[in-house]
């Protein structure tokens, strides 16, 4: 996929809502300047293109949403990548000013001569993009046109602030709730001494700031912080790993707020360095329970404690996923390449049948085989519904006693689209009430994932814990399954009786040596000695003095 | 308004077969709706057989149906219909189709009157 | 596989009174939830979805709650015409389910 042909998915209807998905993966480092996309992707692409067309035919099929008033889509490829995304935008944008013009009757042909050809409708507002860098890109571009943007899973905390980011919204919470549970666990196990991995971008760069400040505030230190781009190239890997060798054995959990290609790349390294089980990584809803991340390399991910987002699994979506065919699913331009190279095989006679395959794909083949949904499913389908509940809340406003579009709602007004959609409040697909703050922001909820060897050769994501609303609750059983196992994150030990810390020059306040206080001095707190005053002594515990009783010596007593 | 009519319910011999009809007025089957066949014997409980998709043709049955029932659409003629092998007498019952709508999941908004099909020697 | 327990099979309520009807499903169903009303001889009509929503022209009286596994219905003001059967339904999901309906709820009215 070349930036020369852009593949668009469409479904017609009266309004057009854009969406931008990472279809294929970003390009890789040599393939930037053309701006050509990676592989296809299957839940963080394809599974989120299939909730955008069949959410909305749920919504179109609602006789109580948006009466008369039929949605439809343009859906875009991010390839998780801005300037990839912010080229897509352009075309939504572009399709709105051909619209508007053609409204005020500007549009003519070449020659001259006036068109008779209906443009495409205008975007009224954009689903995503995933990416909090990308995502950021976008709102730049669509805050200057009016058009709201409502995010699925760019949780950056930059994006809260509404003087820059005015037509932004989210169906997820800020990273600033994440860093902090990431930072309660850390204390709950009292690893006072760890090091610290971002990916490069929006997303790593805020989240580990936060991360940071919350450490330096409840007394624990990074040995180090590293950063390193997700799609940065084995070299760079194995040298962000042999630093944290460097830091070995002190510093061996790695709290990582990352992109689950960041995690990936980090695990590789360590299968091609030798480093299994060396480090316990902490990582951030990037990594959440994603097989993708881990899929050859669970040796190396044993143990790892990440964040997840707190969203079931949406049954309904699965019912109609599962079903999904090549020959029958035509108006998902990628699906064909997508089934490919699910099932490495050609789809003989098909259009996009690709030749690089040998094997020829037989008709047994489903969906169901190995199927994990997008574990943030329930978000994305969220954040669709909130467009629709925005847009029906807008229309019962403009239209009263008027089922469908009026003239009061054409063309359709982004501030007060944007006005209605800060005021939405609905059932999500959880179950939950969905609704938007000050800043266009979703509460959060996180489950507390643990990556496991549950029989041989056998790995998974287990449940060990939540963090609500500030409350961390863990299953320290399942964790370690029993206290000795709890693995060791400090710097320094705590001193003995009688010592104190003494921090060198330029280290970390969690690293220190100890020494021993002279025979006359105390521990007067933990960097200090002082002496005793004169006809005092230290006490037995060395944690003051006390005086020394008075001998008074008589001629008969003997030698002392 | 929108409409769903059963027909095809009959007396039938066990081991017979039977096609049952739905058809539906008031709305389109290209549009996308989940339309669904209930049974209810006498005196019992509702249960549910089986669903199509009526944009794709995806069908979904319970899981007891063992392949004796078979759900199929027609967008052009608006129907759906259910077609029953190997009737035994617990097959009777009136059998009922309904339309699932929108956000709530499958919910069952609209309903036939019902056909009763009696399985009996 | 989705299990759809209905308590009590049958209760016997006061004209005026208020009845209350429980609903358990076998796993979370994320208040995808529906309860229908039926008369004898009549089909099912739908009376509350997504678990607390009213369907159009139903009455405030009736009212749905619940979350994860556990849902109610509760009747209000029992008036003789709420004399029916009342069944709760899941809408989750159609995949590997046996029945996606509760067994049933008989409500008299004194």
């Known amino acids: 996929q070349s930036s020369e042909r852009r593949v668009v998915a469409h479904m017609p209807g009266d309004i057009i809502i854009g969406a931008l998905f990472s279809v294929h993966h970003q390009p890789t480092v040599d393939k930037v300047h053309e701006r050509k996309c990676g592989a296809v992707r299957e839940q963080y692409g394809i599974q989120r293109v299939e909730a955008m067309l069949h959410t909305l035919e749920r919504i179109n099929s609602d006789p109580t949403l948006l009466p008369n008033i039929t949605l439809g889509c343009e859906i875009r490829d991010s390839c998780w990548h801005s300037a990839v995304a912010l080229e897509q935008s352009i075309e939504f944008i572009r399709d709105s000013l051909i619209s508007s013009e053609e409204e005020e009757g500007l549009v003519r042909c070449v020659d001259g001569s006036s068109s008779s050809f209906r443009s495409k409708k205008p975007i009224v507002g954009v689903i995503g993009p995933g990416s909090s860098s990308v995502a950021i890109q976008v709102q730049n571009l669509l805050q200057l046109f009016n058009i709201p943007q409502i995010a699925y899973s760019a949780t950056s905390m930059d994006l809260s602030d509404k003087t820059l980011f005015k037509y932004f919204m989210r169906v997820v919470p800020s990273d600033a709730q994440q860093a902090r549970a990431m930072v309660d666990i850390v204390k709950r196990y009292n690893w006072t001494y760890v090091s610290a991995v971002h990916t490069e971008g929006n997303y790593g760069e805020s989240g580990m700031e936060a991360f940071k400040d919350m450490s330096a505030k409840e007394g624990i230190c990074i040995a180090h912080s590293y950063k390193i781009y997700s799609n940065a190239g084995e070299q760079s890997f194995d040298k962000l790993l042999k630093k944290l060798t460097s830091h070995l054995p002190k510093a061996r959990v790695v709290a990582c707020f990352c992109e689950g290609m960041t995690v990936r790349g980090l695990l590789m390294a360590m299968r091609r360095l030798g480093l299994a089980g060396e480090f316990l990584l902490l990582g951030s809803d990037g990594w959440a329970d994603r097989y993708d991340v881990t899929d050859g390399y669970q040796r190396e991910a044993v143990g790892g404690i990440t964040i997840k987002l707190q969203s079931p699994d949406v049954k309904w979506f699965d019912d109609y996923y599962l079903k999904l065919r090549p020959e029958t699913n035509h108006r998902n331009p990628w699906f064909q390449e997508f089934w490919q190279h699910r099932f490495q095989c050609r789809l003989e006679g098909f259009p996009q049948e690709n030749s690089k395959y040998n094997k020829t794909c037989n008709s047994s083949l489903t969906l169901k085989t190995h199927h994990v949904q997008d574990s943030k499913m329930g978000f994305v389908i969220n954040a669709i519904y909130s467009m629709a509940y925005g847009l029906h809340n807008m229309q019962m406003s403009l239209c009263p006693g008027y089922a469908g579009l009026c003239d009061a709602m054409k063309p359709i007004d982004g501030r007060k689209l944007l006005e209605s959609l800060m005021k939405t409040n609905f059932t999500g697909v959880s179950g939950d009430t969905i609704l938007f703050d000050e800043n266009g922001d979703s509460p959060g909820r996180y489950e507390i994932m643990n990556f496991k060897e549950m029989g041989k050769d056998y790995f998974d994501y287990i449940n060990v814990g939540s963090w609500d609303n500030g409350e961390l609750k863990m299953d320290d059983d399942e964790v370690w399954s029993k206290k000795s196992n709890i693995i060791r994150s400090v710097c320094s030990e705590p001193c003995e009786k009688g010592q104190i810390k003494v921090i060198r020059k330029g280290e970390v306040s969690c690293c220190w040596t100890c020494t021993p206080c002279k025979e006359n001095e105390y521990v007067f707190d933990e960097y200090t000695c002082k002496a005793c005053q004169l006809g005092s002594w230290p006490t037995d515990d060395l944690t003051g003095c006390d005086l020394i009783p008075v001998q008074y010596l008589r001629w008969g007593d003997p030698e002392p | 308004q929108e409409q769903l009519e059963e027909s095809g319910g009959d007396l039938v011999k066990p081991e017979g077969s039977l096609t049952l009809t739905c058809t539906a007025s008031?709305?389109?089957?290209?549009?996308?709706?989940?339309m669904c066949w209930v049974r209810q014997a006498p005196g019992k409980g509702l249960e549910w057989i089986a669903c199509i998709y009526t944009s794709s043709g995806s069908t979904y049955y319970a899981n007891w149906v063992n392949g004796r029932f078979t759900i199929s659409r027609s967008t052009s003629l608006n129907t759906v219909t259910l077609q029953v092998t190997s009737l035994t007498a617990a097959d009777t019952a009136t059998y009922f189709c309904?339309?699932?709508f929108g956000v709530g999941g499958y919910s069952f908004n609209l309903w036939g009157q019902g056909t009763l099909v009696t399985v009996s020697s | 596989a989705y299990d759809m327990t209905q308590t009590p099979a049958s209760v016997e309520v006061a004209v005026g009174g208020t009845v209350t009807i429980k609903c358990q499903a076998s796993q979370s169903i994320s208040s995808y939830l529906s309860w229908y009303q039926q008369k004898p001889g009549q089909r099912p009509k739908l009376l509350i979805y997504?678990?607390?929503t009213l369907a159009s022209g139903v009455s405030s009286r009736f009212k749905g709650s619940g979350s994860g596994t556990e849902y109610s219905l509760s009747i209000s003001g029992m008036e003789c015409d709420d004399a029916a059967t009342y069944y709760c339904?899941?809408?989750?999901?159609?995949?590997?389910?046996?029945?996606?309906f509760g067994g049933g709820t008989e409500v008299v009215v004194k």
């Open positions: 997504r678990a607390s």
């Open positions: 309904a339309k699932s």
């Open positions: 008031g709305f389109s089957f290209s549009n996308y709706y989940y």
């Open positions: 339904q899941q809408g989750t999901t159609i995949s590997d389910v046996d029945n996606v």
